[in-house]
Amino acid sequence: VPLSRTVRCTCISISNQPVNPRSLEKLEIIPASQFCPRVEIIATMKKKGEKRCLNPESKAIKNLLKAVSKERSKRSP
């Protein structure tokens, strides 16, 4: 019988709320792994440095990811 692995994801709660890309200090995308079977997106806000988990399935968050990657591709030569 295989040992049951304890699931230890970082995100206890998630937000579906839209986030203004300008208010972001950092956006971490943690891929699924042996410890956590789901993708986790952690946003660190500029104001107060609050950290929030974002719902990868939310339309608003998908749009945010598109906007952020667009911004990054503009910056890179």
Epitope: C9, I12, S13, I14, C36, K48, E50, R52
Partner: antibody
């Protein structure tokens, strides 16, 4: 709003299941906690479960005896308590997670009393 | 024995300023934010301060929180009779199994 139920008087070694009915917020996106308070004592955190039920953390004092679970379709949180001991006697509160990192407790229910006595 | 250390009691006369300390370690207060809860007699705890120094809506600005290193404090300025309650600090602890840790509570008495 959070409303706990299922408390009562139980003998040592027996089991009890507490429920917490949630309303007024999007239950399926918030982690949920159980916290207890023995008569005349301070607050003791018991367990937390993630929004999807996939991640659970327990206090050492209840690990292996208590199980936290949730039913998002019913907007209900549960605490299955097995092998109860006299020291588990307390008011049990459910609480909504703050929503940010790290986890924390936001809104609390009014509590349900569990008495473990022979 | 609570993981976070608070004085068991504090007191003051109406209008005075009362400060409650909360001492922890690098795995809790040192690396995570602190929340404070007020528990009035016979009632459930209520969130008073979150993320070290933020007040939820409806909490008077007489209550303020701060954090430095592995310690935090709650200040009540202009103490009022309705502030007589138990106050608890709490933080997430990054220890191996991860959990929320509380202080033992401080009973505030208005003289």
């Amino acid at each position: 709003q959070l409303v706990e139920s299922g408390g009562g008087v139980v003998q040592p070694g027996r089991s009890l299941r507490l429920s917490c009915a949630a309303s007024g917020f999007t239950f399926s996106t918030y982690g949920m906690h159980w916290v207890r308070q023995a008569p005349g004592k301070g607050l003791e955190w018991v367990a937390v479960i993630s929004y999807d039920g996939g991640t659970k953390y327990y206090a050492d004092s209840v690990k292996g005896r208590f199980t936290i679970s949730r039913d998002n379709s019913m907007k209900t949180l549960y605490l299955q308590m097995n092998s109860l001991r006299t020291e588990d006697t307390a008011v049990y509160y459910c609480a909504k997670d703050l929503g940010d990192l790290p986890p924390g407790l936001d809104y609390w229910g009014q509590g349900t009393m569990v008495t473990v006595s022979s | 024995q609570s993981v976070l250390t608070q004085p068991p009691s504090a007191s003051g006369t109406p209008g005075q300023r009362v400060t409650i300390s909360c001492s922890g370690s690098s795995s809790n207060i040192g690396s995570n934010t602190v929340n404070w809860y007020q528990q009035l007699p016979g009632a459930a705890p209520k969130l008073l301060i979150y993320t070290n120094n933020q007040r939820p809506s409806g909490v008077p600005d007489r209550f303020s929180g701060s954090k430095s290193g592995t310690s935090a404090s709650l200040a009540i300025s202009g103490l009022q009779s309705e502030d007589e309650a138990d106050y608890y600090c709490a933080a997430w602890d990054d220890s191996l199994n991860g959990n929320v840790v509380f202080g033992g509570g401080t009973k505030v008495t208005v003289l």
